[in-house]
């Protein structure tokens, strides 16, 4: 009888099924959808999380479509193909043989095509801009306090190395969090900025992926910071390839 058997849960991913019957009596927590035994000491990849979300019972699924003015991720949810390490495959296709290329956060970066479409490599999203609007407060937050609190949040809750939080901008009521992480900067074991941004996005929508933790309770010097709108912009190391007709 081991400690693993007493506490066989996955703190970082509630979309798992856990059992204490792994090798040597270890706890194993398998992600819904993919069935992969995930690492519960860190964030699960966005690709495996989307796969789990799409495998959940339909009555438990809420299709959240981003604001029509956001030029990102406005295709909604899809059931992704993940590579052998849980990352998005560069080419994604649906059941009707419509295919498209995605970046490392799974956002479409080309026009849709057919099965002949080629996506030569998975292009890395190296810069993420999280644009928030907070609910009205008595006064503006102190910028340095806000900066410190958001950096603490990404470090402690999402386990993102502080060097990847490039900046926090604030012009009441808009907050912008810049995450930057080049391929060369990301070491083995580092949380990916795309995964951290996805966990944050789900947190602010009140759909936390963490097991048994309360929702996000953001406070700046005791004052609640309540987010009323979120937009996330993704910048890739190689610019996306959309035809001109999409821009008109």
């Amino acid at each position: 009888h081991t400690a693993a058997q007493d506490n066989c849960t996955c703190p970082t991913n509630k979309m798992t099924v856990c059992s204490p019957d792994g090798p040597g009596g270890r706890c194993q927590c398998r992600a819904l959808g993919s069935g992969v035994a995930v690492d519960c000491s860190t964030l699960t990849s966005k690709c495996l999380l989307l796969k789990a979300r799409m495998s959940a019972p339909k009555n438990a699924r809420t299709l959240v479509r981003p604001n029509e003015h956001a030029l990102v991720d406005n295709d909604g949810l899809y059931d992704p193909d993940c590579d052998p390490e849980g990352r998005f495959k560069a080419r994604q296709c649906n059941q009707t043989s419509v295919c498209w290329c995605v970046n490392s956060v799974g956002v479409r970066r080309t026009d849709k095509g057919d099965l002949s479409l080629r996506c030569d490599e998975l292009v890395r999203t190296h810069h993420i801009l999280i644009d928030l609007r907070h609910r009205p407060t008595a006064g503006a937050f102190n910028h340095s306090d806000l900066d410190a609190e958001l950096r603490r949040l990404f470090r402690e809750r999402y386990r993102l190395h502080p060097k990847f939080v490039a900046a926090v901008h604030y012009e009441q009521p808009t907050i912008q969090i810049e995450l930057r992480q080049n391929t060369s900067q990301k070491a083995a074991g580092d949380v990916d900025i795309g995964d951290a941004a996805y966990y944050f996005e789900r947190d602010v929508k009140g759909e936390s992926l963490f097991q048994g933790r309360g929702g996000l309770d953001l406070r700046v010097r005791g004052e609640p910071l309540q987010v009323e709108r979120t937009l996330i912009y993704y910048l890739d190391e190689i610019p996306p390839k959309f035809s001109m007709k999409r821009l008109t």
Epitope: A3, R26, C29, V36, A37, V38, D39, C40
Partner: nanobody, 120 residues
Framework: QVQLQESGGGMVHPGGSLRLSCAAS????????MSWVRQAPGKGPEWVSY???????YYPDSVKGRFTISRDNAKNTLYLQMNSLTPDDTALYRC??????????????WGQGTQVTVSS
């Protein structure tokens, strides 16, 4: 990029044997723990064997004494020898780059799998 390619699956009669292989590339195979995981139709995945980089092996009770996991580090290949097969062993078998933490079993990468069908 990690790649794991299984082979050796097929149809076999109850009581028969099969040997599965998994060719690994894109990582230091000799320094990695590996496992075999199977998924039967309509059931969840279950690990059926585990081998550490040093050669220590683990098996669940369901296959103990019938299955043997081994590795050839010179060939970057993982094996699973399966004897005394029963219809309950029918499943998709995939190999995984895995590890054990203090409390958890984790799969860091996995193959597409090879189908094993045991039927009379």
């Amino acid at each position: 990029q990690v790649q794991l390619q299984e082979s050796g699956g097929g149809m076999v009669h109850p009581g028969g044997s099969l040997r599965l292989s998994c060719a690994a590339s894109g990582f230091t195979f000799s320094g990695s723990d590996m496992s075999w995981v199977r998924q039967a139709p309509g059931k969840g995945p279950e690990w059926v064997s585990y081998i550490t980089s040093g050669g220590t092996t683990y098996y669940p009770d369901s296959v103990k004494g019938r299955f043997t996991i081994s590795r050839d580090n010179a060939k970057n290949t993982l094996y699973l020898q399966m004897n005394s097969l029963t219809p309950d062993d029918t499943a998709l078998y995939r190999c995984a780059k895995a590890r054990l933490t203090d409390s958890h079993y984790v799969e860091d990468a996995w193959g597409q799998g090879t189908q094993v069908t045991v039927s009379s």
